[in-house]
Interface confidence: medium
C-alpha cells in the first residue's frame, strides 16, 4: 500500500520501533531479554520476561515453578500459563481436606451416605458429600444415584472419608470390594515418580506436538505424540497402556493414541479382582481358585527408582466383577497392598508420609 510508505519510513527511522507489515502498524521494539505479549507491542508494558516451560512469571517478576499435579489423586484444573501457576484439584470422587496454594495437600474420597441417609449435597473437589435422613417412603438404597451403587461389604462412614494422599491409606475405612476403582487406581500408581507415566516409572521425553495425520497448515488437527505403548490421557499426559503380558490375560483392544490397551481374562477364566483397563486376578470359571500372588507387570524397568511392591491378593470368590466395569489393570488393588505382610517397606518416594504399624500395615502419618 503506497499510502503506508511514509508511515513505514518514519517508523523505521525510530530505533525503538519497527514496522510490522502484517498488521501495517509501527510496533514497540522490546528490549533484549524481554518478549512481546502481543503481536505488535505498543509500549514497554506490552513486553515481559520469558520463563522456561513449567515456570510462570510471578508478581515479583521472577520465574517460579508452576505446581505439579503429578500426584495420582490430583488433576490439572488450570494449565501453567506465562503469568500464573498451574492449578490442581482433587480427582473426581475426592475432595480436598488440606488446601495449599494452587493445589491440595491431602485428598480424601467422598463419603458414601450410610443406609437410611441420602445425599443432600454431592461431593465436589472442595467439599465432602453432605448426607441427610431419607424421607419416609423413599427407598434409602436408591434415593440417589450414588446410593444405587452401594458397596457389597460395608460403606465408608460419612465422618471418616478415606485418605489417599499423597501415598497413604487406611484400610479400616476403605471398602474392600464394590466401589474400589479409585482406590485400586491410587494403589496401582504408588510407584510413580512425579510426572512420570503411570505404571512404568521410566522417563518420558517431551516429543512436542505431532499431527493425527500430517499437520495441515493452519489446522487444529495436531496433537501431542506419545511414545510406543503410551496413550494421551484426558489430562493431556502420556500414560502407559496396561500390559496384557500375564499368562491369564488376553488383549481385548489395542493401545491407541488416545486410549489404553484393554486386557481381559483368557477364555475359561473370569475376573475376580478388576482394575482399570485390565484384571488384577483371574480365576477359573466357575470354580473359585485358591489365593494366588500375581506379580504386577510393567510396574518398573531396570532404570527406575522404585520397584513394584510384592502382592498378596485377597481371596475372592465373586463370580462376577465387582463393579460391572471393564476388567482392569495388572496393578495390585489398594487392599492387597495394605494387607500384604511382605510389604514391610513400600518402595515409594523416599519421603512419602507412610508409617508401618506392628501388623505391617501402613498407617496414616499426620505429618
Amino acid at each position: 500500500f503506497p499510502q503506508d510508505r511514509p508511515f513505514e519510513d518514519t517508523c523505521r527511522g525510530n530505533p525503538g520501533h519497527y514496522y510490522d507489515k502484517a498488521v501495517r502498524r509501527c510496533c514497540y521494539r522490546c528490549p533484549t531479554g524481554l518478549f512481546p505479549t502481543q503481536q505488535c507491542p505498543q509500549r514497554p508494558a506490552d513486553c515481559r520476561k520469558q520463563c522456561e516451560p513449567d515456570y510462570y512469571l510471578d508478581e515479583a517478576g521472577r520465574c517460579t515453578a508452576c505446581v505439579s499435579c503429578s500426584r495420582d489423586d490430583l488433576v490439572e484444573k488450570m494449565p501453567c500459563a506465562w503469568n500464573s501457576s498451574r492449578v490442581c484439584e482433587c480427582q473426581p470422587g475426592m475432595f480436598c481436606a488440606v488446601s495449599v496454594v494452587n493445589s491440595c495437600a491431602r485428598c480424601f474420597f467422598h463419603s458414601v451416605c450410610p443406609a437410611g441417609m441420602i445425599v443432600k449435597f454431592p461431593g465436589t473437589a472442595q467439599k465432602n458429600t453432605v448426607c441427610e435422613p431419607a424421607s419416609p417412603g423413599v427407598s434409602p438404597a436408591c434415593a440417589s444415584p450414588e446410593n444405587c451403587k452401594e458397596p457389597s461389604s460395608g460403606t465408608i462412614p460419612q465422618a471418616k472419608p478415606t485418605p489417599v494422599s499423597p501415598a497413604t491409606s487406611n484400610a479400616s475405612t476403605m471398602p474392600l470390594r464394590g466401589g474400589t476403582r479409585l482406590a485400586q487406581e491410587a494403589a496401582s500408581k504408588l510407584t510413580r515418580a512425579p510426572g512420570s507415566p503411570s505404571s512404568v516409572g521410566r522417563p518420558s521425553s517431551d516429543p512436542g506436538l505431532s499431527p493425527t495425520q500430517p499437520c495441515p497448515q493452519g489446522s487444529g488437527d495436531c496433537r501431542k505424540q506419545c511414545e510406543p505403548d503410551y496413550y494421551l490421557d484426558e489430562a493431556g499426559r502420556c500414560t502407559a497402556c496396561v500390559s496384557c503380558s500375564r499368562d491369564d490375560l488376553v488383549e481385548k483392544t489395542p493401545c491407541a493414541w488416545n486410549s489404553s490397551r484393554i486386557c481381559e481374562c483368557r477364555p475359561g477364566m473370569i475376573c475376580a479382582t478388576s482394575a482399570t483397563n485390565s484384571c488384577a486376578r483371574c480365576v477359573p470359571y466357575p470354580i473359585c481358585a485358591a489365593e494366588t500372588g500375581t506379580k504386577p507387570q510393567d510396574m518398573a524397568e531396570k532404570d527406575t527408582t522404585f520397584e513394584a511392591p510384592p502382592v498378596g491378593t485377597q481371596p475372592d470368590c465373586s463370580p462376577t466383577p465387582e463393579n460391572g466395569e471393564a476388567p482392569a489393570s495388572t496393578s495390585p488393588t489398594l487392599s492387597s497392598l495394605v494387607d500384604s505382610q511382605a510389604s514391610k517397606t513400600l518402595p515409594i518416594p523416599t519421603s512419602a508420609p507412610i508409617a508401618l504399624s506392628s501388623t505391617g500395615k501402613p498407617v496414616l502419618d499426620a505429618g
Epitope: 505439579s68 515418580a193 512425579p194 522417563p203 518420558s204
Partner: antibody, heavy 123, light 107 residues
Framework: EVQLQESGGGLVQPGGSLRLSCAAS????????IHWVRQAPGKGLEWVSY????????DYNQNFKGRFTTSANKSKNTAYLQMNSLRAEDTAVYYC????????????????WGQGTLVTVSS | DIELTQSPSSLSASVGDRVTITCKAS??????VAWYQQKPGKAPKVLIY???YRYSGVPSRFSGSGSGTDFTLTISSLQPEDFATYYC?????????FGQGTKLEIK
C-alpha cells in the same frame, strides 16, 4: 547418548574477553534449554545463565547480566557464553548443562553436564 | 534470591556409616530440590530430584526427603565411592541457586 562438551577456556587478562562453546549431541538441540553453571576453585556451584536454542531467548543471573551473553547456533548444535570485562573473581570452571526431561513436568535440574572448561583471569 | 544453607560444611565418616546432610532454604521451595554428588575434577552428578526421587541408576542407599524449607540427603551405608562433595539445588524460582556444599571425607 546425551553429550555436552565445553571448549574455549584459557588464560585471559583482567578486562579481557573470552567465548566459551558447548557442543551438544545425542538429543534434539532445539528442544531443551542449555544452562551455564560455574565453579570457582575450591568453591560451590553458581548458576550463570541459560539459552533457549529454539527461540534464542536467554536469561541471566543478575550478577552476570551486562557482562555475559549467551547465544546458540542451531545448525552447529552449539551454545556459547560470551564473557566480557573479565575480572579475577571470574576465574572458575565453566560447565554447560541440560535440563531434565523426566515425566510431564520440565523443571530445571540437571541430569546432563559437560566436563567443564577452566577460565583463568590473571595478569 | 533464595539462599540454600547446607550443614555440615564438612564431615568425616567411615565405610558403613549412616550419613545425613541437611539443606535449608530461605523461603518455601515446595519439593523443587535436587541433590548432586561431585568428585574432584569431575562434573556434578544428580542423585535426587523433586526432593525425594532417586535418579535412574543411583544406588538405593541414597535417599532424599523434605518439603518447604527443610531437606535432607541420607546415605544409609557409606561405600568407599561415596566420599565426595554434595550439593543441593533449588529450581523453584529463578535465579537457580545451589547450597555451598558438604564435603564428606574418610575418617
Amino acid at each position: 547418548e546425551v553429550q555436552l562438551q565445553e571448549s574455549g577456556g584459557g588464560l585471559v587478562q583482567p578486562g579481557g574477553s573470552l567465548r566459551l562453546s558447548c557442543a551438544a549431541s545425542g538429543f534434539t538441540f532445539t528442544t531443551y534449554t542449555i544452562h551455564w553453571v560455574r565453579q570457582a576453585p575450591g568453591k560451590g556451584l553458581e548458576w550463570v545463565s541459560y539459552i533457549n536454542p529454539s527461540s534464542g531467548y536467554s536469561d541471566y543471573n543478575q550478577n552476570f547480566k551486562g557482562r555475559f551473553t549467551t547465544s546458540a547456533n542451531k545448525s552447529k548444535n552449539t551454545a556459547y557464553l560470551q564473557m566480557n570485562s573479565l575480572r579475577a573473581e571470574d576465574t572458575a570452571v565453566y560447565y554447560c548443562a541440560r535440563r531434565a526431561d523426566y515425566g510431564n513436568y520440565k523443571y530445571t535440574w540437571f541430569p546432563y553436564w559437560g566436563q567443564g572448561t577452566l577460565v583463568t583471569v590473571s595478569s | 534470591d533464595i539462599e540454600l544453607t547446607q550443614s555440615p560444611s564438612s564431615l568425616s565418616a567411615s565405610v558403613g556409616d549412616r550419613v545425613t546432610i541437611t539443606c535449608k532454604a530461605s523461603q518455601n521451595v515446595g519439593t523443587n530440590v535436587a541433590w548432586y554428588q561431585q568428585k574432584p575434577g569431575k562434573a556434578p552428578k544428580v542423585l535426587i530430584y523433586s526432593a525425594s526421587y532417586r535418579y535412574s541408576g543411583v544406588p538405593s542407599r541414597f535417599s532424599g526427603s523434605g518439603s518447604g524449607t527443610d531437606f535432607t540427603l541420607t546415605i544409609s551405608s557409606l561405600q568407599p565411592e561415596d566420599f565426595a562433595t554434595y550439593y543441593c539445588q533449588q529450581y523453584h524460582t529463578y535465579p537457580l541457586t545451589f547450597g555451598q556444599g558438604t564435603k564428606l571425607e574418610i575418617k
